[in-house]
């Protein structure tokens, strides 16, 4: 009988272990992308930006999905989303329409079921890139911890795309859950 | 029998609350490095800063070690890297040789394996100086989302830093480990 | 026999998976705060920001208590910290005093045992805000990982505080509990 | 070719002004800081001033402070050095010298004009 | 104001013979410190930076070591086009201040 018993016992912990280190993988989705250069959209008004490598360098997605540009929410959960974005321009690149620049980030979040789109997180700054310096460079960076329920959408737009610093260190976003909804 | 079942039950909830407990904190490195002023090198390109506080004041480090300038990771994860650079200049500082100057930060990734350096994070700003102000101040903040392996090497290199901030709320680094790699 | 011994397996997979989920929530205090735009203090100097919303749009709050303008630590644990500024000024808000300007922001942590405020975090830049532009912006954010108490308190100071910018997507800062202290 | 040269020298009397020259060619001008290095006659070198790149930071030893004045136009790739209140132990070779690239804070020079002399004398 | 003692003041030798110049500093100075060359009627050339950083151009023979006050000029074989006088300086303060010079002669 306590040979049985230790036997179960073994069998409870064993498969505990490997239920908890299972749960614990798979409740934490989380997404590295970082800009797709070959696909940058021109403008200097608000854009958005859709091309973002997901599998390449230090871009990777576990339990979340990349669609149409947009990172979609999986699973329910409290995330840590983050983004930075360089921009820069060398005067070899040719003459800036302005010297006064506002370069910006807003990481939204899209709820399908309620078609609106809101602003979580913002930042950047107003600039003013004269023709005295050869080169030129700002980065932004924004985080924050948020609420996201499963098949929501996260994107990013920023002003000036075209001054977009194409390197995988410098232009990215990501997102992490931190913990599940009450 | 009855009363050694609920033994053992107690004997299976009480070590897995132990173990639960212990596999957490040992499954969660971390570090928060901050700047030693004592030695900061010069020089105005990119530069490794080799010297950091990981037991006084802010700065700690837990299952991840330091060594020869570099935070080495122990164990294998995904982790959340961030640093925090500020840069300051007041007119009783020195003879500043420049208004135009590029303050950078860059998060590096060394494998001792491959022999190989990579950049995970960039951040900055070309920034204009002048004179006709006494003092001048510029933080830079980057983060993101890691697959690190046990035996790679987290390292900073910034430009001008003869211009940090030597303040441990202004000039540092960390780590956290957010989870196991599948 | 063995069916009493499956029952109470069950019994403790319940209980377990039960007790991990409910620790494993509980654990995690967060906090996501955003800045109160009818009660913005004026000045230039250092001033702390004692208005924000913890539990309405994007702010919430678990686990920890919001009082007196003060996030307050109701768990002993590691957690990260973070803090997204964002300043503006638009020509039709009437002339700047100054069209220099420093603005920064700081994250402190008082301790009610020992009186004492230090800071975790500082950020920012000096900034020329020329009347040569109509609109100026600039944005800090500052992150990192620190040990914190039950009964401590985190609190944001900035500069120049009638600059903010009052939406919810611009002025915020948090914390998430990472892991516990050994 | 990098070069410098100095113009402007010439014998004035104690208490009286010159103003010297340096005209850069073969680099980029705008991006370095420059200085005005003397020797006397038969002596070691003195730095006597230094500019910042775009011309908002000046630079003097006590010894001209107040009496000195360094500016620069940079669209001109020029440098100026505005001698007053003139004394005998300001008789030397003034050198126009470009600082280096290197630590913001840490000033030598790589390259040196062949100098212009001042000689202050009643 | 940091000041600089450089020696000797003057020296002379023979062609392929090592030549060795010292530079005190008043205060620490790091690794903060340049050597120059001034031939006779010329303007002075930069040699060395930064203690032992050789300038673009400039042969090895020529070298610079110490850090903090104590610093090391060589010439590891002199030749005959080496003759001049020779100056430090630190740049590691404003007001960048000058040895007094060594001048090398050649036997």
């Known amino acids: 009988g306590s040979q049985h018993i230790r036997a179960e016992k073994a069998m409870v912990d064993g498969s505990w272990l490997d239920l908890a280190k299972r749960s614990k993988l798979e409740a934490q989705p989380f997404a590295h992308l970082t800009i797709n250069a070959t696909d940058i959209p021109s403008g200097s008004h608000k854009v958005s930006l859709s091309s973002w490598y997901h599998d390449r360098g230090w871009g990777k997605i576990s339990n979340m999905t990349f669609s149409n540009g947009k990172l979609i929410v999986n699973q329910d959960g409290f995330y840590y989303l983050y983004a930075n974005i360089c921009f820069r321009h060398h005067e070899t690149s040719g003459d800036l329409a302005t010297e006064y620049l506002q370069l910006m980030v807003y990481v939204t979040k899209t709820s399908i079921k309620i078609p609106s789109s809101h602003t979580l997180m913002k930042g950047g700054s107003t600039k003013y890139w004269s023709g005295n310096s050869e080169f030129h460079f700002y980065s932004i960076n924004v985080g924050g911890f948020f609420k996201l329920r499963s098949g929501e959408e996260i994107s990013i737009e920023v002003s000036n795309p075209s001054l977009l610093d194409p390197d995988q260190d410098a232009t990215y976003f990501g997102a992490f859950k931190v913990r599940d909804i009450d | 029998g009855s009363q050694h079942i609920r033994a053992e039950k107690a004997m299976v909830d009480g070590s897995w609350l132990d173990l639960a407990k212990r596999s957490k904190l040992e499954a969660q490195p971390f570090a928060h490095l901050t700047i030693n002023a004592t030695d900061i090198p010069s020089g105005s390109h990119k530069v490794s800063l080799s010297s950091w506080y990981h037991d006084r004041g802010w700065g700690k480090i837990s299952n991840m070690t330091f060594s020869n300038g570099k935070l080495i990771v122990n164990q294998d994860g995904f982790y959340y890297l961030y640093a925090n650079i500020c840069f300051r200049h007041h007119e009783t500082s020195g003879d500043l040789a420049t208004e135009y100057l590029q303050l950078m930060v860059y998060v590096t990734k060394t494998s001792i394996k491959i022999p190989s350096s990579h950049t995970l994070m960039k951040g900055g700003s070309t920034k204009y100086w002048s004179g006709n102000s006494e003092f001048h101040f510029y933080s830079i903040n980057v983060g993101g989302f890691f697959k690190l392996r046990s035996g790679e090497e987290i390292s900073i290199e910034v430009s001008n830093p003869s211009l940090l901030d030597p303040d441990q709320d202004a000039t540092y680094f960390g780590a956290f480990k957010v989870r196991d790699i599948d | 026999g063995s069916q009493h011994i499956r029952a109470e397996k069950a019994m403790v997979d319940g209980s377990w998976l039960d007790l991990a989920k409910r620790s494993k929530l509980e654990a995690q205090p967060f906090a996501h705060l955003t800045i109160n735009a009818t009660d913005i203090p004026s000045g230039s100097h250092k001033v702390s920001l004692s208005s924000w919303y913890h539990d309405r749009g994007w702010g919430k709050i678990s686990n920890m208590t919001f009082s007196n303008g003060k996030l307050i630590v109701n768990q002993d644990g590691f957690y990260y910290l973070y803090a997204n500024i964002c300043f503006r000024h638009h020509e039709t808000s009437g002339d700047l005093a100054t069209e220099y300007l420093q603005l920064m922001v700081y994250v402190t942590k008082t301790s009610i045992k020992i009186p004492s405020s230090h800071t975790l975090m500082k950020g920012g830049s000096t900034k020329y805000w020329s009347g040569n532009s109509e609109f100026h912006f600039y944005s800090i954010n500052v992150g990192g990982f620190f040990k914190l108490r039950s009964g401590e308190e985190i609190s944001i100071e900035v500069s120049n505080p009638s600059l903010l910018d009052p939406d919810q997507d611009a002025t915020y800062f948090g914390a998430f509990k990472v892991r516990d202290i050994d | 070719e990098v070069q410098l040269v100095e113009s402007g020298g010439g014998l004035v009397k104690p208490g009286g002004s010159l103003r010297l020259s340096c005209a850069a060619s073969?680099?980029?001008?705008?991006?370095?800081?420059m200085s005005w290095v003397r020797q006397a006659p038969g002596k070691g070198l003195e730095w006597v001033s230094g500019?910042?790149?775009?011309?908002?930071?000046?630079y003097y030893p006590d010894t001209v402070k107040g009496r000195f004045t360094i500016s620069r136009d940079n669209a001109k790739n020029s440098l100026y050095l505005q001698m007053n209140s003139l004394r005998a132990e300001d008789t030397a070779v003034y050198y126009c010298?470009?600082?280096?690239?290197?630590?913001?804070?840490?000033?030598?020079?790589?390259?040196w004009g062949k100098g212009t002399t001042v000689t202050v004398s009643s | 104001d940091i000041q600089m003692t450089q020696s000797p003041s003057s020296l002379s030798a023979s062609v392929g013979d090592r030549v060795t110049i010292t530079c005190k500093a008043s205060?620490?100075?790091?690794?903060?410190i340049a050597w120059y060359q001034q031939k006779p009627g010329k303007s002075p050339k930069l040699l060395i930076y930064?203690?032992?950083y050789r300038y673009t151009g400039v042969p090895s023979r020529f070298s610079g070591s110490g850090s903090g006050t104590d610093f090391t000029f060589t010439i590891s074989s002199l030749q005959p086009e080496d003759l001049a006088t020779y100056y430090c300086?630190?740049?590691?303060?404003?007001?960048?201040?000058f040895g007094g010079g060594t001048k090398v002669e050649i036997k």
């Open positions: 010298a470009r600082r280096d690239y290197g630590d913001v804070y840490e000033w030598y020079f790589d390259v």
């Open positions: 073969g680099f980029t001008f705008r991006n370095y800081a």
């Open positions: 500019i910042s790149s775009g011309g908002t930071y000046t």
């Open positions: 205060q620490d100075v790091r690794t903060s």
């Open positions: 930064s203690a032992s």
């Open positions: 300086q630190q740049h590691y303060s404003s007001p960048w201040t």
